[in-house]
């Protein structure tokens, strides 16, 4: 989704939860 | 300086829909992740779903019925909806940034009662 | 029934070292995935102490570790301290969703 947009789609993207840990932890510089 | 934090309704009817909105500052809901939590007085915490940094959205099974969450980027919030409440639902819903194994700020919690 | 199975309660002196368990399956814990462990005293926000089964979050006293032994996610806290009396859960999913252990109370004895 484009800054400025509300995103309702479910599934646009083919990630994993398993993937979306791991970036999150990452972009948390945890 | 990271924050998140929840509202509305603290009352809601059986049978109604629940919705609560996050407001987050501090970092962006497009890059990071949110995730929505509730505990119900003296229980442990139940993991509602989240919204991922892909855009994906993700949901406990046993409310994926039931559970929507949606994000809009130009207001730092994300949603929760929950249809079909019942007393069940009364619970402290929280959401907070990350998904799960590493969710390292919080919302301060708004109860939510379920009650005619 | 909780998908992560921990004590219900468990107890040490002052100074001792205690240790709480998570025990899961080869679909979360055993996988690989990551463990998160928190803790939560009564009227606040669960607070992370340890992210990536292993490390601790920033902030955290090095007397709390986390580590893995197969389907097992262990907290483990030395030199308890009267201000660890809370509750702990441990948190990891699998496939498409997460979830939270089934909490395990510290006591602290003086």
């Known amino acids: 989704s484009s800054t400025g947009s509300i995103d309702m789609v479910d599934s646009p993207q083919l990630a994993t939860l398993a993937d979306e840990v791991s970036a999150s932890l990452a972009k948390q510089g945890l | 300086q990271v924050q998140l934090q929840e509202s509305g309704p603290s009352l809601v009817k059986p049978s109604q829909t629940l919705s609560l909105t996050c407001t987050v500052s501090?970092?962006?809901?497009?890059?990071?992740?949110v995730a929505w939590v509730r505990q119900a007085p003296g229980k442990v915490p139940e993991w509602l779903g989240a919204?991922?940094?892909?855009?994906?959205?993700y949901y406990n099974p046993a409310l994926k019925s039931r559970l929507s969450i949606t994000r809009d980027t130009s207001k730092s919030q994300v949603s929760l909806s929950l249809s079909s409440v019942t007393t069940e639902d009364t619970a402290v819903y929280y959401c907070?940034?990350?998904?799960?194994?590493?969710?390292?700020?919080w919302g301060r919690g708004l109860l939510v009662t379920v009650s005619s | 029934q909780a998908v992560l199975t921990q004590p219900s309660s468990v107890s040490g002196s002052l100074g001792q070292r205690v240790s709480i368990t998570c025990s899961g399956s080869?679909?979360?814990?055993?996988?690989?995935?990551?463990v998160g462990w928190y803790q939560q005293v009564p009227g606040s926000a669960p607070k992370l102490l340890i992210y990536?089964?292993?490390i601790r979050a920033s902030g955290v006293p090095d007397r709390f570790s986390g580590s893995r032994s197969g389907d097992t996610a262990t907290l483990t806290i030395t030199s308890l301290q009267a201000e660890d009396e809370a509750d702990y859960y441990c948190?990891?999913?699998?496939?498409?969703?997460?979830?939270f252990g089934s909490g395990t109370r510290l006591t602290v004895l003086g």
């Open positions: 907070a940034r990350g998904i799960i194994a590493g969710v390292d700020v």
């Open positions: 501090g970092f962006s809901v497009i890059s990071d992740s």
């Open positions: 919204s991922g940094s892909s855009g994906n959205k």
């Open positions: 080869s679909s979360n814990v055993g996988y690989g995935n990551y």
């Open positions: 990536g089964t292993a």
């Open positions: 948190a990891s999913y699998q496939s498409n969703y997460a979830f």
